[in-house]
């Protein structure tokens, strides 16, 4: 991925919360590229040694993934081309809470954005009619 220019691209994240034991979504969007093979997505968690997830050249690249996330992450591969870099996190744990970075490289340039992810036992509010 030596093709990326020196320009910045816009990356947008949204703070979110995950229910322990359920699946969660870490939301991230970016300026799309016309070639999937030119897009690199890296998810990092502050303080964690390995990567949370990496997607490059049209597929997952998980050789550098931290073991705390092994088997628990996925991007929406068919939506990457339209600028969706959101991460699905399976079986959310209390220790998944923290600051995450969505880092994007495309032929247009690079960009990143952070998001705060909270975890807990959240319940849907009851509606009494």
């Amino acid at each position: 991925f030596g093709i990326s220019g020196r320009h910045s691209i816009t990356v947008t994240t949204v703070a979110s919360a995950g229910n322990i034991g359920e699946d969660g979504i870490l939301s991230c969007t970016f300026e799309p590229d016309i070639k999937l093979s030119d897009i690199v997505i890296q998810w990092l968690k502050e303080g964690v040694l390995g990567l949370v997830h990496e997607f490059k050249e049209g597929k997952d690249e998980l050789s550098e993934q931290d073991e705390m996330f092994r088997g628990r992450t996925a991007v929406f591969a068919d939506q990457v081309i339209v600028g969706n870099a959101s991460l699905r996190l399976k079986n959310v744990q209390l220790t998944d809470a923290g600051t995450y970075k969505c880092y994007i490289i495309t032929s247009k340039g690079k960009g990143n954005a952070n998001l705060e992810y909270k975890t807990g036992a959240f319940s849907m509010p009851e509606v009494n009619v």
């Epitope: 991925f1 890296q42 990092l44 502050e46 303080g47 964690v48 040694l49 550098e64 073991e67 705390m68 220790t95 923290g98 970075k101 880092y103 490289i105 690079k110 990143n112």
Partner: antibody, heavy 117, light 107 residues
């Protein structure tokens, strides 16, 4: 203020032992992997060891493997480096550093370890 | 182990100069490259992480570029406080390794 403060350095004879401490403040210590990095007098930086945020993974430089042990006590917000079988070539300033975004983002001021007979 | 080679090992420059330091990895390290500044008697300070991301509080005259094996740290207009030693560091595999350093001196 985010801060790391090393202590425990000093003069020790070859073959001796020393335990370094690094007191952390101003951040959630238990959420971060932590490193030790050293610098021999007039030389460059050398990574020594790392411990993951939960203490489950530890990695060492070949030069210290089997002699040094990294550990942490999250209840005390403190990182440790137990150094045994010290050699003259272990003489250096030892820094503790926080693992941020894939990098050493916060460093302590360093503590000098001198190994000499 | 991944070897990191910095060049030059030292350079002389004047205030206002554009300064470029290069770092080469012995194998592909993607964008997992960091740059640090160290002044005599002080701890190192993180400048750039992930090859090109500027650490908070670091002046915008510092920039990083590159991927794979070849990386560059650029100081667009050297300031008096920038005279120091600069180190690159790979973060892709253990043992983590540093370049030998580049000392930036006053001409």
């Amino acid at each position: 203020e985010v801060q790391l403060l090393e202590s425990g350095g000093g003069l020790v004879k070859p073959g001796g032992s020393l335990r370094l401490s690094c007191a952390a403040s101003g951040f959630t210590f238990s959420s971060y992997a932590m490193h030790w990095v050293r610098q021999a007098p007039g030389k460059g930086l050398e990574w020594v060891a790392v411990i993951s945020y939960d203490g489950s993974n530890k990695y060492y430089a070949d030069s210290v493997k089997g002699r040094f042990t990294i550990s942490r006590d999250d209840s005390k917000n403190t990182l440790y480096l137990q150094m045994n079988s010290l050699k003259t070539e272990d003489t250096a300033v030892y820094y503790c550093a926080r693992h941020g975004w894939d990098a050493f983002d916060i460093w302590g001021q360093g503590t000098l370890v001198t190994v000499s007979s | 182990d991944i070897q990191m080679t910095q060049s030059p090992s030292s350079l002389s420059a004047s205030v206002g100069d554009r300064v470029t330091i290069t770092c080469r990895a012995s194998q592909d390290i993607s964008n997992r490259l960091n740059w640090y500044q160290q002044k005599p008697g002080k701890a190192p300070k993180l400048l750039i992480y992930l090859a090109s991301s500027l650490q908070g509080g670091v002046p915008s005259r510092f920039s990083g570029s590159g991927s794979g094996t070849d990386f560059t740290l650029t100081i667009s207009s050297l300031q008096p406080e920038d005279f120091a030693t600069y180190y690159c560091q790979q973060a892709i595999s253990f043992p983590l390794t540093f370049g030998g350093g580049t000392k930036v001196e006053i001409k």
